[in-house]
Amino acid sequence: EDWQCPRTPYAASRDFDVKYVVPSFSAGGLVQAMVTYEGDRNESAVFVAIRNRLHVLGPDLKSVQSLATGPAGDPGCQTCAACGPGPHGPPGDTDTKVLVLDPALPALVSCGSSLQGRCFLHDLEPQGTAVHLAAPACLFSAHHNRPDDCPDCVASPLGTRVTVVEQGQASYFYVASSLDAAVAASFSPRSVSIRRLKADASGFAPGFVALSVLPKHLVSYSIEYVHSFHTGAFVYFLTVQPASVTDDPSALHTRLARLSATEPELGDYRELVLDCRFAPKRRRRGAPEGGQPYPVLRVAHSAPVGAQLATELSIAEGQEVLFGVFVTGKDGGPGVGPNSVVCAFPIDLLDTLIDEGVERCCESPVHPGLRRGLDFFQSPSFCPNPPGLEALSPNTSCRHFPLLVSSSFSRVDLFNGLLGPVQVTALYVTRLDNVTVAHMGTMDGRILQVELVRSLNYLLYVSNFSLGDSGQPVQRDVSRLGDHLLFASGDQVFQVPIQGPGCRHFLTCGRCLRAWHFMGCGWCGNMCGQQKECPGSWQQDHCP
C-alpha cells in the first residue's frame, strides 16, 4: 500500500496565539466615541473622544490636536467657552454621547452628557494630509430653548444615535435617544427626531418633528438605540426594546425603524421586528421548532456584499445587507447554543416587507383587528385609522402616520453556531475581491476576521488575534480609514488592516498558499508571510 503524507487537521494548520502588533493610540481614558474623516484631497483624520477631551489624530494615529470638552463649568473647557460666559447649567463631566461628521460642510459635531445635551460644531481645516478642528461653534440658542421644547438639546445621558443627511442647503440630523422620566423632564431630547442645522450654526431650527415615548410609559418602557445608518432613500435606526408595552418589560426584542431621508417628516416612520435564530442542523429534543431565538441585538453594520455571499442570500452582488450580532438576553450570558449569532437582512427585502405591511394596514380590505402599533409613541388604533381615532377623515391618509409592520423578518445564524463561546462586541463588514469579511471585536479583546459564508461547518478565518494584553472588551463602534479599521478597547485605539494583520498564523505551506489573494500571503523559507517580511525567497505558487 502506497505511503501518503499524514493529512494535517485544519485546526492544526494555524496558530491563533501568534502575536501581532498593530499601530495604536493611548487616549488617556476610556474611549467613548470615535469617527474617521477622509477628504477628497488625501487629507484624513481620526477623532477620538474620552471623558472631557477630544483628540484629533492623523492617519498614522499620531496626535494632531486635543481639545478640552469638559468639565462643564471649568474655565479650561474649550468647547464650553464657545457658548459665551456661563454658567450654562450644572457643572459636571462631559461624556461624549454623539460624535458624527457632517459631510456637507465638512465638520465634526460632538454632543455630550453635560449642558443639556447640546452639541458643538467644529469645522474641519485641512493642512497637508492632516486635519485640524476650527474653533467650535456652540449649537445652542438660550432664548429658543425651554425644558419642554428644546431644539438644541440633542444628546441623552442614556445614549443617543445620530445620522446626518444633506438635504437642500442644510444638514438634517436624524436623532434617536434613550429616555427615562428624569431625562424626559429636563430639556427632553425626545426619542426620535429630525432637526435642521441652522445656517448660522447657532443651533437647530425650532418646530422640528419628533416622536417620544409617552409619559405614562417612560418608567417601564426603555428603548436602546444600537445603531443608525443611511442608505438609499432612508435612514434606519436599530433598537432593543420590550416586545410589548403591557407585558414583562424584560422580554426584549430587536426592531428596525425606517425614516425617509428625503423628506424631513415622520409620517412615514415605520418599524419592523427583526428575528434572528440559531437553527442547528440537527435539532435537539425539546429545542424550539424554528430554532432558538436570539432576540437582543448587540452590534450591527450594513455593507454591500461580495458575489459568493450574495448568491447564498439570493441577492445581487453589491447589494446592501444589514448584518447584526444577536445574543439571547441583555447580559448575553451562556445558554444552550452559541453566545453570539450573526444574521443577515438584505435591505431591499426589509423595505419590501415594510411596504407590504403598509399595504396590509392601508389598502382595503383591511384585516379586522390589525393594529397600527407603536402604542408607546402614539394612541392605540386599528388600521387604517390614524392614532387615537375611530375612523379616517376624508383629508387624512392612512399612510401618513407611524406604523409597526405586523410581520417580522426572520433569519438564521450565518455561522451555524460556530462562534460558540465567543461574545462578539463589535462588527464591521467589508467586501474584499468577491469575498465578504466580518471583522469582529470580542469581549476578551480579540479581533476575529472571518469570511461570511453560510454553507460550511467550520469558520474561514482571515485572522484571530489579541489586540493587546489588557483583554478589555472591544467597543461597539468601528471606523474605517482607507484600508484599515479602527477598533477601540479600553483607553486604546487600534488600527487593523482590513486584509488582516499578517500571515504568520498560517503554519503550513499548503494552508498559507490557500489563503485569500487579498491577504498577500506567500511561503517564506519555513513560515508564511507577506512579501515585505521576506528578505529571501517568497513563493506564492507552490510548496517546497
Epitope: 456637507a104 438635504q167 437642500g168 442647503q169 445656517a199 448660522d200 450654526a201 432613500a233 428625503t262 423628506e263
Partner: antibody, heavy 121, light 107 residues
Framework: QVQLVQSGAEVKKPGSSVKVSCKAS????????MNWVRQAPGQGLEWIGR????????RYNEKFRDRVTITADKSTSTAYMELSSLRSEDTAVYYC??????????????WGQGTTVTVSS | DIQMTQSPSSLSASVGDRVTITCLAS??????LAWYQQKPGKAPKLLIY???SLADGVPSRFSGSGSGTDFTLTISSLQPEDFATYYC?????????FGGGTKVEIK
Amino acid sequence: QVQLVQSGAEVKKPGSSVKVSCKASDYTLTDFYMNWVRQAPGQGLEWIGRIYPGTDKTRYNEKFRDRVTITADKSTSTAYMELSSLRSEDTAVYYCARSAYYGNYVAMDYWGQGTTVTVSS
Amino acid sequence: DIQMTQSPSSLSASVGDRVTITCLASQTIGTWLAWYQQKPGKAPKLLIYAATSLADGVPSRFSGSGSGTDFTLTISSLQPEDFATYYCQQLYNTPWTFGGGTKVEIK
C-alpha cells in the same frame, strides 16, 4: 422688490482671473444663501457654489473648487465670485441667484441679470 | 453627483396645446426639485419648487408632479409667452445639478 444687480461684461485673457459682483437690495444679504450659476453659450446651467453671508461659509462644486472663491461684503450687501486660471471653456454668462426656504424646501427664487465673461487670447 | 436627465430636449407645439416635460434623477431626491423657465438673453425664472408647488406669480396653467426619481412639468394650455427653455434642478445634495433643458418652440 428684491433685486440682484450684477457687474458688467468682462473680456479676459487665458490664465487670468475675473471677479464678478452681485449687489442685493430690498432684503438682508446675511439672511439668505447666495449661489453662483453659469451658462456657456447655447448650453445648460451649471451650479458653481454658494455662500451664506451671515457666516461667510461657502460650499463649492468640486469641479471648480481649485479655482473659485465666493465672498460677501455685508457692509455693501454685495456678493462676489472670483474665478482664476481662466480658459476658453470658461466663456459663459455668470448668474448670481438667491436661494430661500419655502417650508422645508429650497429654491433659487431671485436671479441677477447675468454677467458675460469672454475668455479669449 | 446626481445626474438629471430631461426629455425631450426640444419640442414644437401650438398655442393651446398641453405640453409635458419629464425629468429623471439618477438617484432618489424626494421632492427636492425645482423647475425654471428661461427666455433668450434673460435669467432663469422660478416656476415650481418642492416638485409640485407653484412659485408666487406663476400662472396656474403650470403644474409639477412626481417624487423620488421621476418628475413632470405640465403646461395645460400653452400661451405665446410660454415659448422658452425649461430646466429642472435637484436641490437635494450638492453639487446642485440641472437637467439639460427642454426648448419649447412654436410649431
